[in-house]
């Protein structure tokens, strides 16, 4: 399963789409910056087996997909870009699911790293709470867009390390 290679390209396409989605000048949003507590340690360890690593990445993509599929998101972003972004994420999710099924026969370790997946879930809960508290303002969405771009970039490093391990 050559997921890291294909996923890395998909990740890059998703990042480009995210970058294009900006609607307002981020310079007006500086005071809305927020510490979402990206679970960096979940993407630092080399202890993961491949299937476990993929399951953590899958959770991150799934949560991003959920976040950008809300009606509040649809009201904020340009529709055609949002659709392309969602399609890209959906493709990545499908690739990952197929890859995990392939890996299960190869590895004897548990399929999922429950603690890591929970950490990713809680991270996205903090993002959703922030948006709610900020009443889904344009600046709040701009801060979240920047945060998701950063988390995608950090997970990309994780994927590259995973590819080197193969």
């Amino acid at each position: 399963c050559d997921l890291p290679q294909t996923h890395s390209l998909g990740n890059r396409r998703a990042l480009i789409l995210l970058a294009q989605m900006g609607r307002i000048s981020p310079f007006s949003c500086l005071k809305d910056r927020h510490d979402f507590g990206f679970p960096q340690e979940e993407f630092d360890g080399n202890q993961f087996q491949k299937a476990q690593a993929i399951s953590v990445l899958h959770e991150m993509i799934q949560q991003t997909f959920n976040l950008f599929s809300t009606k509040d998101s649809s009201a904020t972003w340009e529709q055609s870009l949002l659709e392309k972004f969602s399609t890209e994420l959906n493709q990545q999710l499908n690739d990952m699911e197929a890859c995990v099924i392939q890996e299960v026969g190869v590895e004897e370790t548990p399929l999922m790293n429950v603690d890591s997946i929970l950490a990713v879930k809680k991270y996205f809960q903090r993002i959703t709470l922030y948006l709610t508290e900020k009443k889904y303002s344009p600046c709040a969405w701009e801060v979240v867009r920047a945060e998701i771009m950063r988390s995608f970039s950090l997970s990309k490093i994780f994927q590259e390390r995973l590819r080197r391990k193969e």
Epitope: G22, P26, K31, D32, R33, V143, E147, M149, R150
Partner: antibody, heavy 121, light 107 residues
Framework: EVQLVQSGAEVKKPGESLKISCKGS????????IGWVRQMPGKGLEWMGI????????AYSPSFQGQVTISADKSISTAYLQWSSLKASDTAMYYC??????????????WGQGTLVTVSS | DIQMTQSPSSLSASVGDRVTITCRAS??????LNWYQQKPGKAPKLLIY???SLQSGVPSRFSGSGSGTDFTLTISSLQPEDFATYYC?????????FGQGTKVEIK
């Protein structure tokens, strides 16, 4: 290794134009903003303005608005600061520094070495 | 614009002394404050960000505190390499603004 490398010292006459540069390496250039800071001889730090290299959006300090132009060329990971007509009072050390944008990360964590601009007739 | 006022503007201290520099903002900036150290002929160096977070590679003798309008940089035990000028800077809103600097000299 993250680096911001600035162009060399310049000696100019009043009324001349000038463009100094700041080249980033060792990180994703479009993921960070680049700010410019002036330090006149024996004085403190003054923020001039900032650019988002991903789309060349800029913001200026009111003190420098209309006096300088900040630009960037993301294809060569370089930001610029330029004057169309220099004055003697522009004599200073100019620093570029990277800023994390809207991310919760250290501000101005890496700085260029500085470009000394001397304007004298 | 948000004005940043540092005090004192200069101070004399000895190696081993505890040194405190204060910075006051003209309006609340939450915790959006950074501290920099600058030595003659060198670029500024980030010490503390978001009021109290120690930048990677900076010795633990440096610490920052405060929120709202009043902030403090503390050097718990001054070392010979700490003699320099220190600047605070607000990163709450544009235009970004620096304090006028505090020069720490050898007594």
């Amino acid at each position: 290794e993250v680096q911001l490398v600035q162009s060399g010292a310049e000696v100019k006459k009043p009324g001349e134009s000038l463009k100094i540069s700041c080249k980033g390496s060792g990180y994703s250039f479009t993921s960070y903003w680049i700010g410019w800071v002036r330090q006149m001889p024996g004085k403190g730090l003054e923020w001039m303005g900032i650019i988002d290299p991903s789309d060349s959006d800029t913001a200026y300090s009111p003190s420098f608005q209309g006096q300088v132009t900040i630009s960037a060329d993301k294809s060569i990971s370089t930001a610029y600061l330029q004057w169309s007509s220099l004055k003697a009072s522009d004599t200073a050390m100019y620093y570029c520094a990277r800023h994390p944008g809207l991310n919760w990360a250290p501000d101005f964590d890496y700085w260029g070495q500085g470009t000394l601009v001397t304007v004298s007739s | 614009d948000i004005q940043m006022t540092q005090s004192p503007s200069s101070l004399s201290a000895s190696v081993g002394d505890r040194v405190t520099i204060t910075c006051r903002a003209s309006q609340s900036i939450d915790g959006a404050l950074n501290w920099y150290q600058q030595k003659p002929g060198k670029a500024p160096k980030l010490l503390i960000y978001f009021a109290s977070s120690l930048q990677s590679g900076v010795p633990s003798r440096f610490s920052g505190s405060g929120s709202g309008t009043d902030f403090t940089l503390t050097i718990s035990s001054l070392q010979p390499e700490d003699f320099a000028t220190y600047y605070c800077q607000q990163s709450f809103d544009f235009p970004l603004t620096f304090g006028q600097g505090t020069k720490v000299e050898i007594k």
